[in-house]
């Protein structure tokens, strides 16, 4: 019987007696920055490599003894959930631990960069296959822990960190803050976030994806055959790596973008109970539960998107919220939510000859959140048309004039505190699809790319009575790229990406009086890539 | 006392090693930044990450580390040069009182420091 | 799926022994802590021992401490109880069971959380008479 | 060592009641409480565990409550499936002990 996390895990045509996808990851290296290990175990033993490589600090407390099975238990669980014999994720995968936490698992910032230096000169000296760097531990947000991530992972290196298990906002602790790291939280068997004593997994918009991470069995360093079952967001993070190198070792040239896009791709949508996490965190945490692709090749074709959100911006009047694409993403569109329906909208803006999305506060209002969406578009020119506010009554309107350049996404940004309160809703003229409509106090902002084989379309959902959301999807084969709401509705929170669902959220619908301001509409612009599917088809 | 007359020396010879007069101003621009643990029983005060510029030199950071030394020893305080990072990041790690902080954060080259603290097996 | 098959049972004359044993399938077993429970004619159930995956700690029901003893063999993925000085009241049927139950770490030490017993062998039947 | 008291001993009731049974430990034992039913000839089966976390494939019309010393087993709805003796069993330390059982009957 294979163990429940494993078969979690596994798409349904690898499902056998035995847990065995096709390759092991046995191309992929994977660091492990933990506990002392017992590389002898029978699980781990010819797989793990012990570096010489140790920073700890020493243990608490007079009265600690220091026990070799309880201080290597740690790390060989989790060497064990990656690559073990039989209860591993990535059974081909080789390993090397570096010893970073001390026999109660403690450790420190400064140490782990040692480790994560030790490992870039390692690399440098000498130059392998795909590397993946597991960090199952977290402290405190640290600014130089998360600059030394992200200088590994613009070196190519992948890293995967553990959330966090003090049920809390996972973008206060490091590593699991930084954006460069692929950052896991926990889930059980029935796919419920995990409790662990008061407290459990970490949440929130730092977290990429979860896994499992309660009654996970592997490597027990009690004996050399031994077995245990443990919990946390460490043994989530050890199920990612593992998938990681599996799905390196099958595409060795996939970039941390490529990467994660994927990971969110293939992973479980939806199946996670929000209710377990605060209200005002349920939107910004991704419900996705990890997995392997169905097959390690041909996901080439798809055109990846993910969504962003931004920190909070605060409540002052002039604040703002910016949300970033990695450096190998396009930000194809813009969008912005406040729980307080108090904002002044969103515009794309160049930073560092990067598009960023930048939502901005209203007068009263408690804050607004930007939502990217970033998506993988090789050999795009993407570029952003700004309409100013229009006299006319019929309101602002911009389009993607260029040859070839189609509209991603749409985004709207006004300087009045109280837009649409009193104006009738503003209709897109149909037959103008390629085209932006807003206020006409708003100034509308355009996303337009150009990219081999980019085609887009335009997808409405309206509902004429009040609703607290409204939502539009995309079909089968086309890419979620814009979300937004059509103008008009004065008690629209805002809109975001949901996989490939555009959500529209409003006010309360018992504040709201059922006029025809109660009309929501749901605007999604769905994308595919001809080019990428032709250019897979040719490499099969 | 073993270990401390190991300082002592270490001090000596940056000192030895330093011309008089050196600037204390940090270089023209923005001034470097000090950073802690918002969660106070995980910090650890007295060690600290002195972050440098991107672009710094192994070199640089060499020299920074022991014009530290050196001020810090005209002060009458003593420090230990814990490790010099390069390949990731340059800067160092100093093990020094918190009485100097100013002192570093004013040294050229320093974008910012942050104290060291604790991390957690998950 | 996890099976427990328990054999050994019979009739034994007061002041014997019996050795009860437990056939497990699948790593999951050698995993988690395993249970001895007892349930006497008519009666409920009555817990009477478990051990820890390794076999370094070991718990008894305070009637049957110094008579009965639990082990386990990990490579033959099966746990035992041998059972000595037995007497009438030890007539029972015997289930052995395991102890779903994980570890975390906080605060620098492991902590237990336990789930329950999750599954259960058919059963053997111990009769103690003269 | 500590006690568990299920009352009551023995309960009748009909298809579609809602039926609660209430288990008391002696000392407190946090939320370290499972419950199990049992039918005639068969062996127990896991339903509660850690006071009120349904065990995976247990209807949902089974629920636990309760922390310290007081618990409670609740069957929203009973169904012919449902008529068993019930166990509440407390984990303390490393060693169990069972309540005496709780027989569910028809009326």
């Known amino acids: 019987s294979i163990p429940w996390n494993l078969e979690r895990i596994t798409p349904p045509r690898y499902r056998a007696d035995e847990y065995q996808p096709p390759d092991g990851g046995s191309l992929v290296e994977v660091y492990l920055l933990d506990t002392s290990i017992q590389s002898d175990h029978r699980e781990i033993e010819g797989r793990v490599m012990v570096t010489d490589f140790e920073n700890v600090p020493e243990e608490d407390g007079t009265r600690f003894h220091r026990q070799a099975s309880k201080c290597d238990s740690h790390g060989t669980h989790l060497a064990g959930v990656v690559s073990g014999r039989d209860a591993g994720v990535a059974k081909g995968a080789s390993m090397r631990s570096l010893r970073v936490l001390n026999c109660q698992g403690k450790g420190t910032v400064s140490g782990t960069l040692i480790g994560l230096e030790f490992i870039r000169k390692s690399q440098l000296v000498q130059p392998v296959g795909p590397l993946v760097v597991l960090l199952p531990l977290a402290g405190g947000y640290s600014r130089v822990l998360n600059a030394a991530c992200q200088r590994l992972a613009r070196a190519g290196v992948v890293l995967v960190t553990a959330a966090g298990n003090f049920r809390d906002d996972a973008c206060l602790y490091s590593p699991a803050s930084a954006p460069e790291v692929i950052t896991v939280g926990a889930t059980n068997a029935q796919d419920q976030p995990v409790t662990l004593g008061t407290l459990g997994t970490n949440f929130g918009r730092c977290v990429d994806l979860f896994a499992p991470g309660e009654d996970i069995i592997g490597a027990s360093s009690d004996c050399s055959t031994c077995f245990v079952s443990q919990s946390g967001t460490s043994q989530a993070a050890a199920h990612v790596a593992g998938i990681a190198a599996m799905m390196l070792s099958a595409e060795p040239e996939l970039t941390l973008a490529e990467l994660r896009q994927r990971l969110i791709h293939f992973s479980a949508k939806d199946v996670i109970n929000e209710a377990w996490f605060p209200e005002d965190q349920r939107v910004l945490t991704p419900n996705l539960v990890a997995a392997l692709p169905p097959s390690t090749h041909g996901a080439g074709w798809q055109l990846f998107c993910r969504t962003v959100w931004s920190a909070h911006s605060g409540p002052t009047r002039m604040a703002t919220a910016v949300a970033r694409c990695a450096p190998d993403e396009e930000l194809l569109s813009c969008s912005s939510f406040s729980r307080s329906g108090k904002r002044r909208g969103e515009r794309m803006e160049a930073q560092g000859g990067k598009l960023v999305c930048r939502a901005h506060n209203a007068f009263g209002g408690e804050g607004v959140y930007a939502i990217a969406r970033c998506c993988l578009l090789p050999q795009a020119n993407c570029s952003v048309h700004t309409a100013p506010p229009a006299e006319a009554s019929m309101g602002t309107r911009v389009h993607c004039h260029q040859q070839g350049h189609v509209l991603t996404g749409c985004s709207s940004h006004w300087e009045v505190e109280d837009l649409g309160t009193h104006k009738p809703p503003v209709l897109r003229p149909r037959g103008q699809p390629n085209q932006c409509v807003g206020h006409r106090e708003a100034s509308i902002h355009a996303s337009c790319c150009h990219a081999p084989g980019l085609e887009c379309k335009v997808k409405e959902h309206g509902i004429p009575a009040p609703q607290e959301q409204v939502t539009v999807a995309c079909e089968e084969g086309w890419t979620l790229t814009g979300c937004s709401a059509l103008p008009g509705t004065s008690h629209v929170l805002g809109a975001y990406a949901v996989d490939n669902t555009c959500v529209v959220r409003s006010r309360d619908v018992s504040t709201t009086g059922s006029t025809s301001e109660g009309a929501v509409t749901a605007v999604a612009i769905c994308c595919r890539s001809r080019h990428l599917a032709q250019a897979s088809q040719e490499l099969q | 006392q073993e270990d401390e007359d190991g300082d002592y020396e270490e001090l000596v010879l940056a000192l030895r090693s330093e011309e008089d007069g050196l600037a204390e101003a940090p270089e023209h621009g923005t001034t470097a930044t000090f950073h802690r643990c918002a969660k106070d029983p995980w910090r650890l005060p007295g060690t600290y990450v002195v972050v440098l510029k991107e672009e710094t030199h192994l070199s640089q950071s060499e020299r920074t580390a022991r014009r530290l030394q050196a001020q810090a020893a005209r002060r009458g305080y003593l420090t230990k040069i814990l490790h010099v990072f390069h390949g990731l990041l340059p800067g160092f790690l100093v093990k020094m009182s918190g009485d100097l902080l100013e002192l570093a954060l004013k040294l050229p080259h320093v974008d910012y420091i942050e104290e060291d603290s604790s991390v957690f097996a998950q | 799926e996890v099976q427990l098959v328990e054999s050994g049972g019979g009739l034994v004359q007061p002041g014997g022994s019996l050795r009860l044993s437990c056939a497990a399938s699948g790593i999951t077993f050698s995993s988690y802590w395993m249970s001895w429970v007892r349930q006497a004619p008519g009666k409920g159930l009555e817990w009477v021992a478990n051990?820890?995956?390794?076999?370094?700690?070991?718990y008894y029901v305070d009637s049957v401490k110094g008579r009965f003893t639990i082990s386990r063999d990990i490579a033959k993925n099966s746990l035992y109880l041998q059972m000595n000085s037995l007497r009438a009241e030890d007539t029972a049927v015997y289930y052995c069971?395991?102890?779903?139950?994980?570890?975390?770490?906080?605060?620098?030490?492991?902590?237990?959380?336990?789930?329950?017993?999750?599954?259960w062998g058919q059963g053997t039947t111990v009769t103690v008479s003269s | 060592d500590i006690q568990m008291t299920q009352s009551p001993s023995t309960l009748s009731a009909s298809v579609g009641d809602r039926v609660t049974i209430t288990c008391r430990a002696s000392q407190s034992i946090s939320s370290w409480l499972a419950w199990y039913q049992q039918k005639p000839g068969k062996a127990p089966k896991l339903l509660i565990y850690?006071?009120?976390s349904l065990e995976s494939g247990v209807p949902s019309r089974f629920s636990g409550s309760g922390s310290g010393t007081e618990f409670t087993l609740t069957i929203s709805s009973l169904q012919p499936d449902d008529f068993a003796t019930y166990y509440c069993?407390?984990?303390?330390?490393?060693?169990?002990?069972f309540g005496q059982g709780t027989k569910l009957e028809i009326k």
């Open positions: 069993q407390q984990y303390n330390s490393y060693s169990y002990t």
């Open positions: 850690k006071a009120s």
């Open positions: 069971a395991r102890d779903r139950g994980t570890y975390y770490i906080a605060d620098g030490s492991y902590n237990y959380y336990y789930y329950g017993m999750d599954v």
């Open positions: 051990i820890k995956q390794d076999g370094s700690e070991k």
